[in-house]
Interface confidence: low
Amino acid sequence: IVKAGITIPRNPGCPNSEDKNFPRTVMVNLNIHNRNTNTNPKRSSDYYNRSTSPWNLHRNEDPERYPSVIWEAKCRHLGCINADGNVDYHMNSVPIQQEILVLRREPPHCPNSFRLEKILVSVGCTCVTPIVHHVA
Amino acid sequence: RKIPKVGHTFFQKPESCPPVPGGSMKLDIGIINENQRVSMSRNIESRSTSPWNYTVTWDPNRYPSEVVQAQCRNLGCINAQGKEDISMNSVPIQQETLVVRRKHQGCSVSFQLEKVLVTVGCTCVTPVIHHVQ
């Protein structure tokens, strides 16, 4: 997730004080839209166990952040699980990573003052064919 | 366990906190770690046994304006011969992120935090087989 240079057409009848870009600091409604969606990936699906590149989920908790709990995936194997249930090292389990935005209390411990923070999370794992480099 | 309200804290509120009108919070959208870059493995979306494509959704009234979504290319998974094996399933892996939504009501502008579910990629899973009694 990167810097967004956003411009929108302004209603011509509105006063000119409105910045066409997102201002640096905004007052935001405390109610988060869609806030009650399920945030525990263990409960939402069992893909982490059924995948050919299975992963474990680790709980990362930080009370100075919203959401305070984030689940991090760690691939169980270097290889992938084959049809016989064995690890096949001709294939690789690799993490799928995603940059997400969270809220960080700023100044620290303040209940209603936040700053957006970009963090990198491993969401799950996928099985890939390795890149093979042939010796010349 | 329910996620605590955004305003909830385990700490005493310090004296230096900025004043905030009731029912809202102050949000600085100058992103912490803005310039940190993630070094992604090359082309995993094509090398995966459950490959996926990416599309960008663009919304000028959302911050960030660009959100990338993945879509699995196949219902099944790609086997060692490069063919689709429908005895296995390609499934999406999803992650929640926060965005700021700008809303226009007449001449006034308000901002709302929103949770967005992003499909990050796909993984290959053994299907759940339901046996009929």
């Epitope: 990167v2 810097k3 967004a4 240079g5 956003i6 | 310039n35 940190q36 870059r37 070094s39 992604m40 493995s41 090359r42 082309n43 979306e45 094509s46 990416y54 599309t55 960008v56 663009w58 960030p64 304006s65 660009e66 990338v68």
Partner: antibody
Amino acid sequence: QVQLVESGGGLVKPGGSLRLSCAASGFTFSNYYMTWIRQAPGKGLEWISYISSTGGNIYYADSVKGRFTISRDNAQNSLYLQMNSLRAEDTAVYYCARDGGVIISTAMFDYWGQGTTVTVSS
Amino acid sequence: AIQLTQSPSSLSASVGDRVTITCRASQGISSALAWYQQKPGKAPKLLIYDASSLESGVPSRLSGSGSGTDFTLTISSLQPEDFATYYCQQFNSYPLTFGGGTKVEIK
């Protein structure tokens, strides 16, 4: 095969303007971040600007911020660099290059054009 | 901005020699480093990314190593086509920066 062809370079006086173009072919242009990198005569490489696949996210090096504008036209498979208030130190070969990742930027560059020469001199 | 310092700035070597080029970052950049080769009058060519991953089509006599602040590009047995200038580039943070280059010349 992937091809990037720059054009629009030339001789310009200090304070003048120039618009560079980069025509892309052989890949889905709209899926890739693109960048401009320059190389002054006998010198090393300098990254100057970056644009995301949709054109919504843009970065500039401090040395060109406020003077150069990067843009793209995905329908035309073209990347542009509008250069204003040119200075002698902007004299360089300008390369357009493709980011190595699909939609997600990796910020390293797997395909480069042959370059176009910009000379700023009175 | 992160500074990248390459050493040596130039070196002379013979075909078959083992050549090592170093790149030092002014702050930790994890493994977010790429190496490029440039021949006179040509555009740079990506050789290595993520500090040690070989780009497709690049001969395996080239290898990269390192993480944090110290990185190395090694050519195990120098070939005639390897005489060129080599640049490192960090992609850990903006602004993206390149090293000053190392020119590999024929002895």
